[in-house]
């Protein structure tokens, strides 16, 4: 009879055991355990009858289809074999051990007691077959086994090849290299591989193998393992295989497909190819003259590109364009984008015209181009280049007037100062009355007049004031404060200011510049009460022209001292301190009791002690501060009187030979003009210089020159 | 014509506030000043202070900065003094007046429980 | 404050006469600057606004008849009405404007 097993382990004992077997006696087990498991069997008992190749009795051990052992007896002979100690394995998971005794038995004889187990199969070892081993990586578990494949494969639906992804791989430079995955190690099997060249229409693809060709192949069949086909629009070359590469390919078309196929077995180290991208032809190209192509080759395809550039001084002219550089290129149909341009001679073109200055050619024809050279000078001498630049500027390579200081700023001409048209009179002669002065011998001399038309009636004054550039007026804070009611500080309104420049004689305006003011700036510490800080200053609405009635005046250097005691100096105005006098009758021009033409004095300045002392001994509250200076004389006369409010007290600068403004008309004592002791007093500009240029917006070293040379 | 139109009389409890207009036509209102004037029967003229519209500039007389308030509306040329704190002290006559040469018609002012 | 004082406060003439009256400043009200003299001159008729008559102490204002006259400087001035007509009852008031404004007590004048 047949007994069927399925436990995992299990005791086997002859019928009867450990009493003798019966004779005549056949039992079958049968023992199956789970796939990935074999049978171990081992004997602790064996004690069968003895027989030639047990003949008689015997415990047999088998598979399916192969017998494993036949035992009998109870010692080991030529003959016959007991298990004794050895241990019978199945190969798989089944074991049939069969028991059979004869039909007598000469002794008495125990039969056999055996154990089984199911024992773990190491796959992963004892696999030797490449058709079921592992392709990368193998891991033993109890009652099976696995594959997993390196980084960068996939595992086969096979689950034991490792195959890679490589349907996705689109080639579009001119250029390039396409292997077999992990080339030069075998590459994987059981792979599909799609390599796509897509190269621009008006290419051809040139595919050439190189190095290793190791494609798995058949001696017989072509090619029914592994194979590269390539294919070219409807037409497929191949398929290749074996070691010998194919010869290099001109597939005449923008677009190539690769396909590799690779299957589930085989060790070969596969291919490598390089694709080359190869066009139409273009014509030779010749480079214009004064100019060269870049890159310089024997020959151009399409798509190559050529930069034509031109000689420096001379710009790349394309369809009356001109350029840096112009860009060309070689199209499929082996013709260029564009024919070679010319180069032209760079022109700078007409100078920019340069305000109060002139512009010299040294070239001769008044030429512009490229290298080409012009001066710029200033009107002299109302107008000087500042910081003595040369003036002369080169056509440059970019197109543009250069000079080596300015670069391609234009210089500038700055109003010269202190250099009157007439040279004032000798200071070697006292002046003690006023006279006349000729035209041009105060060209900063400046008639403000101011209407206040927010009154009823309109309430107009005037007073002086001093050039000092082309935009700006110096003046007194007391001219140009609005009139309130209170003790305020509040600047007139612009629109309510005219100043009028180069007036001579006040009933002929026609020769004079008259000028709205853009911004009235009073100084911000001006006290109303005892006219310190008594100056403020003027924007003209438009920059006026110099010339020899109107130049501007210098300014003092920074000097808290002031003008030196008893040093000479000229004030001028038309006399309209007059207080009988009407600014009506002024402006019309239509009275006698002023004068119309321009007067001028001749006053020495005052100790400080002294002009202080003279104040303070009136009564009233006068008070001659530190940045107020007097002039005058002790014996009075009418001259101190001259000159309106806020105009300028010059003295010749010896060191710059020029004529600076270092006081402006403020105020003076109660008593009538020219009396005894009654000096006039000055607001002292040294002490305001800093304020002055900041307010202009100047930098100091701008204009310091023009005093200090 | 130049003209100063003023608002008509108010009659007014002590510490209340009263606003008097003076609307000006025939002339560019924005650039002369509006001066306003106090006047009371036995005490003769006193001068409050002045704006000028266009800039919104004021002067007070000291006496009357915690008293009046002066404001102008330039889109329909008006000017205002605001009179605040009332007491019968400021029962009066109010002129407002184009910068000395033109009066307003005045507003006359009663303070009275 | 400027102070202003009108002499005499009220004065009777009979029409046709001439008639002067006074007023003093406490300050100078010449102006340095603009060179002018902040006294002006209203004529207050009986139920009337004032009326300017004289600015910068001697200008005539446009429309005023020229029997008004004002003069003086520094800080005396008079206003003059070289002969007095009925329509001139009023009371006359003078205002310096060289700083905060302020006006003098006034002048009556009654027609006999």
């Known amino acids: 009879h047949t007994v069927e097993l399925n436990n995992m382990f299990g005791q086997i004992q002859s019928p009867g055991y450990p009493d003798s077997y019966p004779s005549d006696s056949e039992v079958t087990w049968n023992i199956t355990v789970p796939d990935g498991f074999r049978i171990k069997l081992y004997f602790m008992h064996f004690n069968l009858e003895s027989s030639y190749l047990c003949e008689y009795d015997y415990v047999k051990v088998e598979t399916e289809d192969q017998v494993l052992a036949t035992f009998c007896g109870r010692e080991t002979t030529d003959t016959e074999q007991t298990p004794g100690q050895e241990v019978v394995l199945s190969p798989g998971s089944f074991m049939s051990i069969t028991f059979r005794s004869d039909f007598s038995n000469e002794e008495r004889f125990t039969g056999f007691d055996a154990h089984y187990m199911a024992v773990d199969v190491d796959e992963c070892k004892e696999r030797e077959d490449e058709e079921l081993s592992c392709d990368h990586y193998c891991h033993n578990y109890i009652g099976g086994y696995y594959c997993s494949c390196r980084f960068g494969y996939i595992l086969h639906t096979d689950n034991r090849t490792c195959r890679v992804e490589c349907s996705d791989n689109l080639f579009t430079q001119r250029t390039g290299v396409i292997t077999s995955p992990d080339f030069p190690n075998p590459y994987p099997k059981s792979s599909e591989c799609l390599y796509t060249i897509e190269l621009e229409e008006g290419f051809m693809v040139n595919l050439q193998f190189e190095d290793i060709f190791d494609i798995e192949d058949h001696p017989e069949v072509p090619c029914p393992y592994d194979y590269i086909k390539i294919k070219v629009g409807p037409k497929v070359l191949g398929p290749f295989c074996g070691e010998k590469a194919p010869e290099p390919i001109s597939t005449q078309s923008h677009s190539v497909l690769i396909l590799f196929h690779s299957d589930n077995s085989g060790e070969n180290r596969g291919w490598r190819l390089s694709y080359r991208a190869a066009g139409n032809e273009c014509p030779e190209l010749q480079p214009p003259v004064h100019g060269k192509i870049e890159p310089s080759q024997a020959k151009y395809f399409f798509k190559d590109q050529v930069l034509v550039s031109c000689d420096t001084g001379y710009k790349v002219l394309k369809d009356n364009v001109e350029m840096d550089t112009f860009q060309i290129e070689c199209l499929k149909d082996g013709t260029w984008s564009n024919k070679i341009p010319t180069c032209k001679i760079v022109d700078c073109r007409a100078p920019g015209e340069l305000e109060h200055g002139l512009i010299t050619f040294s070239t001769r024809n008044n030429l512009t181009t490229y290298k080409s050279e012009i001066k710029y000078s200033c009107q002299e001498p109302y107008y000087k280049m500042l910081n003595n630049n040369t003036g002369i500027y080169t056509c440059s390579a970019q197109g543009v007037w250069m000079n080596k200081v300015l670069g391609r700023s234009l210089p500038t001409c700055l109003p010269e100062c202190g250099q009157p048209s007439r040279s004032l009179p000798s200071l070697v002669k006292r002046i003690i009355g006023g006279r006349n002065a000729e035209p041009g011998l105060f060209p900063w001399q400046a008639l403000i007049v101011v209407e206040d038309t927010s009154r009823v009636p309109n309430d107009k004054w005037f007073g002086s004031g001093a050039l000092l550039s082309a935009s700006w007026i110096l003046t007194a804070a007391h001219v140009l404060r609005s009139q309130r009611r209170d003790t305020t500080v509040i600047p007139v309104s612009k629109e309510h200011v005219t100043v009028y420049l180069g007036l001579h004689d006040v009933r002929d305006k026609s020769g004079a510049v008259n000028s709205s003011a853009a911004r009235v700036v009073l100084h911000p510490d001006f006290n109303i009460q005892n006219y310190n800080h008594d100056i403020a200053l003027v924007q003209l609405q438009e920059p006026v022209p110099l010339g020899p009635h109107v130049m501007p005046v210098c300014l003092p250097r920074l000097e808290p001292e002031g003008p030196a005691p008893h040093m000479l100096g000229l004030v001028a105005g038309w006399g309209i301190s007059n207080p009988n006098v009407t600014v009506d009758e002024i402006i019309s021009s239509g009275t006698r009791t002023l004068s119309d033409v321009l007067q001028y004095v001749k006053l020495p300045v005052v100790p400080h002690a002294e002009c202080k002392t003279s104040y303070e001994s009136r009564s009233g509250n006068y008070s001659v501060t530190e940045n107020m200076f007097c002039a005058g004389y002790y014996e009075g006369g009418k001259d101190t009187c001259l000159g309106d409010s806020g105009g300028a007290f010059v003295i010749f600068d010896d060191l710059s030979q020029r004529w600076v403004v270092q006081g402006l008309v403020s105020w003076g004592g109660p008593e009538e003009c020219g009396s005894k002791q009654v000096y006039g007093v000055y607001t002292k500009v040294s002490n305001y210089v800093d304020w002055v240029w900041e307010q202009m917006g100047l930098p100091q070293s701008v204009v310091e020159p023009q005093v200090e040379r | 014509e130049v003209q100063l139109q003023q608002s008509g009389a108010e009659l007014v409890k002590p510490g209340a506030s009263v606003k008097i207009s003076c609307k000006a036509s025939?002339?560019?209102?924005?650039?002369?000043?509006i001066e306003w004037v106090k006047q009371r029967p036995g005490h003769g003229l006193e001068w409050i202070g002045e704006?000028?519209?266009?800039?919104?500039?004021?002067d007070y007389n000291e006496r009357f900065k915690d008293k009046a308030t002066f404001t102008a509306d330039t889109s329909s040329n008006t000017a205002y003094m605001q009179l605040t704190s009332l007491t019968p002290d400021d029962s009066a006559t109010y002129y407002c007046?184009?910068?000395?040469?033109?009066w307003g018609s005045g507003t006359t002012l009663t303070v009275s429980s | 404050d400027v102070v202003m004082t009108q002499t005499p406060s009220s004065l009777a003439v009979s029409a046709g006469e001439k008639v002067t009256m006074s007023c003093k400043s406490s300050?100078?009200?010449?102006?340095?600057?603009?060179?002018?003299?902040?006294l002006a001159w209203y004529q207050q008729k009986p139920g009337q606004s004032p009326k300017l008559l004289i600015y910068?102490?001697?200008t005539r204002e446009s429309g005023v008849p020229d029997r008004f006259t004002g003069s003086g400087s520094g800080t005396d001035f008079t206003l003059t009405i070289s002969s007095v007509q009925a329509e001139d009852l009023a009371i006359y008031y003078c205002?310096?404007?060289?700083?905060?404004?302020?006006f003098g007590g006034g002048t009556k004048l009654e027609i006999k």
């Open positions: 300050q100078s009200l010449l102006n340095s600057v603009t060179r002018k003299t902040y």
């Open positions: 007046v184009r910068s000395e040469d033109l």
């Open positions: 910068w102490a001697s």
């Open positions: 704006i000028l519209p266009g800039s919104g500039s004021t």
């Open positions: 205002k310096q404007s060289y700083t905060l404004p302020t």
């Open positions: 025939g002339y560019t209102f924005t650039g002369k000043w």
